[in-house]
């Protein structure tokens, strides 16, 4: 690596993937193993993230960019930048300190993650229950009894909602 000759900061010419080494008269030195610099002019290299155990590598660390982790099958990411992996449960369950537990009556979970949520109370909207709820699905509310006059059109239950980015279970 060539010694930099900038008139202002001699480190400003050090490219990404290197650092300005004060111990070597401000020569641009390559980042050591397991470290990187994503921008030029850095006086230190950043530490690469390691994806180990329940984490798996989604993107390898390079001399210019950090690694990215996700979770091994049966787990899902939680927290900032996938800082944690949480165990998946089945639909109709939630994760507790004692493991996966079935949703209590009157609650449901249509995901492999998250908590059981109460069924919709149709009567609050003046509607009636068209399809009963289960551990895996919310109730489907239909028209109020007064709307069910002869000739009224049938109601098609909506597809279960999914979080963005979640593939069908």
């Amino acid at each position: 690596f060539e010694r930099t000759r900038s008139l202002q900061d001699p480190c400003s010419n050090c490219p990404a993937g290197t650092f300005c080494d004060n111990n070597r008269n401000q020569i641009c030195s390559p980042c050591p193993p397991n470290s990187f610099s994503s921008a030029g002019g850095q006086r230190t290299c950043d530490i690469c993230r390691q994806c180990k155990g329940v984490f798996r590598t989604r993107k390898e660390c390079s001399s210019t960019s950090n690694a990215e982790c996700d979770c091994t099958p049966g787990f899902h990411c939680l927290g900032a930048g996938c800082s944690m992996c949480e165990q998946d449960c089945k639909q109709g369950q939630e994760l507790t300190k004692k493991g996966c537990k079935d949703c209590c009556f009157g609650t449901f979970n249509d995901q492999k993650r998250g908590i059981c949520r109460p069924w919709t109370n149709c009567s609050l909207d003046g509607k009636s229950v068209l399809v009963n709820g289960t551990k895996e699905r919310d109730v489907v509310c239909g028209p109020s009894p007064a709307d069910l006059s002869p000739g009224a059109s049938s109601v098609t239950p909506p597809a279960p909602a999914r979080e963005p980015g979640h593939s069908p279970q």
């Epitope: 850095q42 950043d46 530490i47 390691q50 155990g53």
Partner: antibody, heavy 119, light 112 residues
Framework: SLVESGGGLVQPGGSLRLSCAAS?????????MCWVRQAPGKGLEWIAC?????????YYANSAKGRFTISRDNSKNTLYLQMNSLRAEDTAVYYC????????????WGQGTLVTVSS | ALVMTQSPSTLSASVGDRVTINCQAS??????LAWYQQKPGKAPKLLIF???DLASGVPSRFSGSGSGTEFTLTISSLQPDDFATYYC??????????????FGGGTKVEIK
Amino acid sequence: SLVESGGGLVQPGGSLRLSCAASGFSFTSSYYMCWVRQAPGKGLEWIACIYTGSSGSTYYANSAKGRFTISRDNSKNTLYLQMNSLRAEDTAVYYCARDSSSYYMFNLWGQGTLVTVSS
Amino acid sequence: ALVMTQSPSTLSASVGDRVTINCQASEDIDNYLAWYQQKPGKAPKLLIFYASDLASGVPSRFSGSGSGTEFTLTISSLQPDDFATYYCQGGYYTSSTDTRGAFGGGTKVEIK
């Protein structure tokens, strides 16, 4: 580089807000930015961290929970520590530090700012 | 809470000596351990990360080893610039209610 400011003398029970201005890198690159303190003649103590990515997740040591609040302004590339109900034992040099590893390993530190809690 | 225990707390040595500092974690932290050097009135400087990786700009006379709960920092041949206090730090982010991160108490390396 990281430059802390906002330290000074404050009475017990008072409040103080520390700032840490970052230059040469952007918070938008998603780091853990943290505060570490060192009481006079004592060792280092981790206080709090915040993830500069979109989630902004925060993490606190037990000694900081309830009294200290970490925050950041990505547009200003600045980290903050709001300290309330200060006690004499909070007297220390407060450093801000950067972690890219996700495992409390700080490769970049500020020069520190001294907070003195005394009546 | 994670507790890091360093030994010895003070170490007297001469230039050219091989110096070893130990750090013990109260629970298994895999290789999530860093070593820092601090001089009076200055901020700490990262020496070693992931227990054994040398940080950028750090001389090769510094080395780290260990995994799980037992870790070691070694200075192969002590130089005048190495008289300072050394700290180990271990930890990892779990959740905001159960975060593990702690420094050891420090080891002061002084001139014999």
